[in-house]
Structures are given as C-alpha cells and as structure tokens.
C-alpha cells in the first residue's frame, strides 16, 4: 500500500518554501534555520504502522501513524498539531491542524522521485527528494 514510499530520501530541490512557512505563520528565526536545512526522509512500514523520520542539521523528527487515524505531532518548526494521513490516489495526504489553522502536505511518487507538496491557503511549496 505504502511500499512505493519506503526507503531513504534526500532533498534535492525546494521551491517557495519560505513563502509557505510565512503563510503557516513560522517566525523569521525558525524560517531561517528550517530553510537552510537539507533533510533526509526515512520512510518505513511495519504492518499497518507507517513511520516517517526526518533528519537534518535543524531538527530530527519522527511520526508513526496508521492511515486514517488522527495523531499528535510536534513539527520540525515546533508546532503542536493534530495530524491525519490518508492514502488518496497513490499519494499520502497529511492534514495538520493547530491554532484554528490547517495545512496540507501531499507526498507522492513521480518517476524515481518523491515529491512533497505543502499547501497553506493559496501558497504552495514543492520539495523534491531522490533516493539517498
């Protein structure tokens, strides 16, 4: 089900990420270090439990979840959010909610790449990963 996402991925390009973070409400200082980070993303599946680990000089984070089941998450930028991740047309679609706000993070395969689309209101950031 999520097997196409399993593996270690490295960030190779990032577009519009600062504007996305601004729209999310991330402060200047946090945007500065988050924007400089080049994270590796490690995705694994154990039964119905999916784990996504992000490792960078900025922060290491890890989420473990079952599809369709809401969970608590502390994001790399230090938001405490309620998240839910579902599989939609082969993409992992995550919705984070906090402080009356909501953002969507879509992870999808595109050829040999993993593309992450982050959307907040009208602002979209696209971050592309390749296998490490």
């Amino acid at each position: 089900m999520c097997d196409a996402f399993v593996g270690t991925w490295k960030l190779v390009s990032s577009e519009n990420f600062d504007d996305y973070m601004k729209e999310v409400g991330v402060g200047f200082a946090t945007r500065k270090v988050a924007g400089m980070a080049k994270p590796n993303m490690i995705i694994s599946v154990n039964g119905d439990l999916v784990t996504i680990r992000s490792e960078s000089t900025f922060k290491n984070t890890e989420i473990s979840f079952k599809l369709g089941v809401e969970f608590d998450e502390i994001t790399a930028d230090d938001r405490k959010v309620k998240s839910i991740i579902t599989l939609d047309g082969g993409a992992l679609v995550q919705v984070q909610k906090w402080d009356g706000k909501s953002t969507t993070i879509k992870r999808k395969r595109d050829g040999d790449k993993l593309v992450v689309e982050c959307v907040m209101k009208g602002v979209t950031s696209t971050r592309v990963y390749e296998r490490a």
């Epitope: 601004k22 409400g25 991330v26 200082a29 994001t75």
Partner: antibody, heavy 119, light 108 residues
Amino acid sequence: QVQLQQPGAELVKPGASVKLSCKASGYTFTSNWITWVKQRPGQGLEWIGDIYPGSGSTTNNEKFKSKATLTVDTSSSTAYMQLSSLTSEDSAVYYCARLRGYYDYFDFWGQGTTLTVSS
Amino acid sequence: EVVLTQSPALMAASPGEKVTITCSVSSSISSSNLHWYQQKSETSPKPWIYGTSNLASGVPVRFSGSGSGTSYSLTISSMEAEDAATYYCQQWSHYPLTFGAGTKLELK
C-alpha cells in the same frame, strides 16, 4: 527545568571589551536560538541579535553589528556575547533569552547581567 | 523595519477595572508572531501572551490577547494589584525583531 544563568554584574573601563555569558540547562541547547536583549536604565527592550547553537548561524541587529559578537560553546551549553569599544552608552542590563520555535517568542529569560562602563 | 506603537504609554487602573493595551504594527504580520511580555522593576521580562492569544504558563485567565494584521491588543478583564507592571509587545515575523516601547500600567 529550563534555566539560563547569567553573571549578576560586570564593571569595565571605557574602550575595553567584555564577554558576557549565558549558561543554558534543562533542554537540548542546540535546538533553540539564543537571543540577546539590551535594556538601558528606565528604558525599553532592544534586540541585539540571535545565535542558533546547532549551526552557529547568527542574525544581528544592524545597529549592533560592529558592537556585539555572538558565539556559543556547545560543549558547555553556553552562549557568549562580546561587546567591544565600550562607552557609557553600553551601560545597561543585558538579557539572554531562549527562542521558542514556530511562534518565535522568548519563553525563558536569564536574570540579566548589569554592565557598568566607568573609569 | 516593522515599528510597534503601543498605547497608552502610561495608564492607571483601579482594582476590578477592565484594561486594554494596544499594539499597532506598521505593516501586516502573522498573528502567530506577535507576543506580549510583562516586566516588573528590577526583574527579567516574563512571557505573557504568545501568538497573539495564547497565555504563557502561569498567566491568570483574566488576561487575554487578540488581533490580526496590524492591530493587536492585550486585555485584563478585571485589574488586580499584581498586574501593575510594564507590558511590551514584540514581533519576529519580519527582520529585524522589534519591541514596542512599552506600556506602564499602574494601580490607581
């Protein structure tokens, strides 16, 4: 519990330099920006600059760029601010504070170091 | 530079009175990045309200914060003696980080 420890006072002569310290404990030092703030007697708060201990990256107030140099020693979880070419205008209380991510507000403050520049 | 203008600069309130302090921002910022601090004489500032409306740990519920864009406020529903202090607003949405000049609140 999070603590930021600063010396209570420093007395230095005009023209000299001083290195103020801020020792952090109770959290992962490399994960939060440390900020320095100046407060002259009876005045408001003035931002000097930030340093991110995880990388050494700094963000400085242009006004203090030639006055203040920010560094960290991660082995001792201590942030430092060196102030150079001191004058009476530099006499003030200097606070260090921890920046909480996302919101970027100061969730913990040191007690402040009172710097007196006098001959 | 984003300028934060606090008003009033000085005010006095009687116990039980409602108090509102405003912070006007020279250009629009994210409400997540507007904060308030309380400072009493000879002590460090304390985080009081963060992200416009979130009360910091230990802050009495008589305090509240609101606003968006360029206009923000801190409100005390019923003034108490221990609320006498100077309050500063601060933003770190845009470079450089800036503080308001402060509002000194005295007990009448």
